[in-house]
Every structure is written in structure tokens, then in C-alpha cells.
């Protein structure tokens, strides 16, 4: 850069800003206060993001992609604040933004590298495919590509299939694990390194229960303390698998402390719920109640799946009638 008479050029300052898809962010820029303030924000040194001079915005030649999405902190410009408020960032907004600020005595440039991450809450699903059982960890929209790890009984396992579909702005990822015939516990972790956000799914198989017709069964479901934070919103769902698909018996929302019950023979103990114990009772069992029962406790940071297998056998009376 050439030295200029009566003019001070203050070269580049560089910062990294990490934004989340569809959220608002601030691209920071400050300068030494002075008169005749001119502010230009440019993207990749080509596209006009925002211009301010003569005491007001001049957005006539603003690139259309930034229309109605940018503003300055107008009351703070005289104090040396040239930061840009940027609404609803998308993955296409990633890149280098340069803020050029001029006053009567100096010019400064600040570079801001914007990185945008996506992490829609993942899910852990339990599926039957013919005679096989699968656990599937999936995330519908994530960017950049996440790190997915599986553990069996707290030991990392190398088998890690990833089914990935990429769209214009993010990845959709499924990681299935065949757990046929296993009664181990499994854990899947999905990590977005950019957003420093981790989600964990945990699956536990309980010992099978044998019950007689007309009896009741009590099925336990208690969160693992490592993951569970009662202050965080979560949802508990009990469902029963019949012919390969799950039907919901009941669910509980922590935010409203609402319990919705779809099966009249199902009961939940309110006092236990207050102690974060989501065990349930199913009364007056009949033969068609045999099957797999799944308790799903989910929040933004984890999914805890507990599965019980219940075998309902005919009572002696019923057997002797046949």
C-alpha cells in the first residue's frame, strides 16, 4: 500500500464469525471516530452489501441478495461502530466480507470471514426390516459434514455406514447399524465441529418380560443422568410396535407438563414424572399386547431409547377353555 499525503491507511484486521442457518448475526467492524464517515460493506470484494455516506444509507446498487437483510447501528456510527447487522443468514452467504470505512483523515478495512452452520436436531430410530433390527441415527439437515461415532456397551465400534444426500445448502445423513439379536446398549454421537454442537442417541434393551393375560405390566424408563438435564425442554413418548410399525400410546411434554394418553389401559404416575421417572403401567393385558414397547426421551441434545419386550401368555383359565 502506498503512503498517501495527509491520509492514513490502516490495513486489514480479520475476524471469523460463525452463524446459524436462518438466524441473524453481526459482522463486527470498528474505527476511530471522525467526520465525513463513509462505510462500504462488500462481499468477496465484488458484491455491494451495504453503503452509508452523507449520514444515510445508499442502497440503490446493493446486490439483490442482501435486500432488506442488512442494517448498521446508526446511533453508534459516530462512536466508531461500523458493524453490520445481517438477517437470516443462508449457506450462500458464507465467505469474506470486507468493511471499508473512511473518515476525513483515515481509511480502515476490516475483513470478516463468515461461516454458516446447520444442525437440525438429529433423531435415533429403531426399525425392523424383515427379520433384521436396525438402529438409525439421522440428521435431516446439517452443515458442514458431521462426525458420527457409534459405541456398543461404551466401546467405540468401527462399523459406520453413512447414507448421505447433499442438497444445495446442506447434507442429510443416515447412519444405520444392524443390531439384530443383540441385547447390548448402543450410543451414537453426531458432532457439528463448526457450531461446537453435539447430539447423542442412546439405545438400551431391557430383559424380556413374561406376563399372563389380565395381569398388568410395569415398564421402566428413566433417563441416564449423564445426558438428562431437567431444565431443558424434552418430550417422552411411549409406543408399541405392531407388525413393523410403532403406534403411540402416550406422550409427555416437559414444557407444558402435559400428558396425552391414547390407550385407556395405560397409566403414568404423576409423582414419578415429577422425579423424572417415566415408567409406565399397562393394565388388563391381552394376548395382542405382546410385542416391543419403546420409551423415547428426546431433547435438542439427546435421544434416549429404552426398549422392552413383553410376552403375554394365556392364563390357565383361558388355556383350559380351549
Amino acid at each position: 500500500i502506498f503512503p498517501l499525503a495527509f491520509f492514513i491507511y490502516v490495513p486489514m484486521n480479520e475476524q471469523i464469525v460463525i452463524g446459524r442457518l436462518d438466524e441473524d448475526i453481526i459482522l463486527p467492524s470498528s474505527f476511530e471516530r471522525g467526520s465525513e464517515v463513509v462505510i462500504h460493506w462488500k462481499y468477496q470484494d465484488s458484491y455491494k452489501v451495504h453503503s452509508y455516506y452523507k449520514g444515510s444509507d445508499h442502497l440503490e446498487s446493493q446486490d439483490p441478495r442482501y435486500a432488506n437483510r442488512t442494517s448498521l447501528f446508526y446511533n453508534e456510527i459516530q462512536n466508531g461502530n461500523a458493524s453490520l447487522f445481517f438477517r437470516r443468514v443462508s449457506l450462500l452467504d458464507e465467505g469474506i466480507y470486507t468493511c471499508y470505512v473512511g473518515t476525513a483523515i483515515q481509511v480502515i478495512t476490516n475483513k470478516v470471514v463468515l461461516k454458516v452452520g446447520v444442525f437440525l436436531t438429529p433423531v435415533m430410530k429403531y426399525e425392523k426390516r424383515n427379520t433384521n433390527s436396525f438402529l438409525i441415527c439421522s440428521v435431516l439437515s446439517v452443515y458442514p459434514r458431521p462426525i458420527i461415532t457409534w459405541k456398543m456397551d461404551n466401546t467405540p465400534i468401527s462399523e459406520n455406514n453413512m447414507e448421505e444426500t447433499g442438497s444445495l445448502d446442506s447434507f442429510s445423513i443416515n447412519s444405520p447399524l444392524n443390531i439384530t439379536g443383540s441385547n447390548s446398549s448402543y450410543e451414537c454421537t453426531i458432532e457439528n465441529s463448526l457450531l461446537k454442537q453435539t447430539w447423542t442417541g442412546r439405545w438400551t434393551m431391557k430383559d424380556g418380560l413374561h406376563k399372563m393375560q389380565s395381569e398388568h405390566v410395569s415398564l421402566s424408563c428413566q433417563p441416564v443422568n449423564d445426558y438428562f438435564s431437567p431444565n431443558q425442554d424434552f418430550k417422552v413418548t411411549w409406543s408399541r410396535m405392531k407388525s413393523g410399525t410403532f403406534s403411540v400410546l402416550a406422550y409427555y411434554l416437559s414444557s407444558s407438563q402435559n400428558t396425552i394418553i391414547n390407550e385407556s389401559r395405560f397409566s403414568w404416575n404423576k409423582e414419578l414424572i415429577n422425579q423424572s421417572d417415566f415408567s409406565m403401567n399397562l393394565m388388563d393385558l391381552n394376548l395382542s399386547d405382546s410385542g416391543e414397547y419403546l420409551c423415547n426421551i428426546s431433547s435438542d441434545e439427546y435421544t434416549l431409547l429404552t426398549i422392552h419386550t413383553v410376552h403375554v401368555e394365556p392364563s390357565q383359565e383361558t388355556a383350559s377353555h380351549n
Epitope: E36, Y53, G102, V107
Partner: nanobody, 125 residues
């Protein structure tokens, strides 16, 4: 959009003079700071001079200071670059460019808002 047009380039002997013009038909150049840049074959673009819009402050690169003069004629809606004592190393394509008010983008290296297509200056020895 602002359409800038350079003119006045040509072939000149060492020590000679040329006056380059930068015009913008249908647009008021007084609202803009105008900067001059040049690019020689195989070299990076170099900023050489700029004049602000509000106060007509002028800036020069060391390589041309004392030899080149930038000025503005509001009546003719034109900015001039008077080049004296030309040297072979001044051979390049010369561009004018515009930005609002101050020579902010110019001083930072040239992310100017509007550019002309350039005029060739050749200085022979």
C-alpha cells in the same frame, strides 16, 4: 449504473505528456470520488491517484507524485489525469473508477463500485 469512459491514451516519447479524461455521460461525477489505476502486462493493478467528491482532496502514489496531477471539471462532468515527464515504466492500460464521496475503496486497493474499460498509454524510449 454509472458508465465510465476513459480517453486520451496513446503513444508518446519518454519525457512527453498526455492528458487522460474520465467522463460519465448521463451521470454526475461530482457525487463521486474518482480514482485512477493502471495495469502493465504481467503486473498487478496499481492505484495511482484519486480525488474526493466533497472537498476535491487529492492523493497520489509515490511512483507518480510530482509528475501526475488529478483534477475535476464539474461543468464538463469530467475528471482529468495530467501526466508529465512520462517514463517507459508508465506504459500500461489506465482505468478510472468511481466510488461515493471519499477515496475509501481506492486507498484500500481498488474494490471500486464502477469501472471504465481502460485506455492504453505507451511510452517509448
Amino acid at each position: 449504473d454509472v458508465q465510465l469512459q476513459e480517453s486520451g491514451g496513446g503513444l508518446v516519447q519518454t519525457g512527453g505528456s498526455l492528458r487522460l479524461s474520465c467522463a460519465a455521460p448521463g451521470f454526475t461525477l461530482d457525487d463521486y470520488a474518482i480514482g485512477w489505476f493502471r495495469q502493465a502486462p504481467g503486473k498487478e493493478r496499481e492505484r495511482i491517484s484519486c480525488i474526493t467528491s466533497s472537498t476535491n482532496r487529492t492523493y497520489y502514489a509515490n511512483s507518480v507524485k510530482g509528475r501526475f496531477t488529478i483534477s475535476r471539471d464539474s461543468a464538463k462532468n469530467t475528471v482529468y489525469l495530467q501526466m508529465n515527464s512520462l517514463k517507459p515504466e508508465d506504459t500500461a492500460v489506465y482505468y478510472c473508477a468511481a466510488e461515493p464521496i471519499l477515496c475509501v475503496l481506492w486507498s484500500a486497493g481498488g474494490a471500486m463500485d464502477y469501472w471504465g474499460k481502460g485506455t492504453q498509454v505507451t511510452v517509448s524510449s
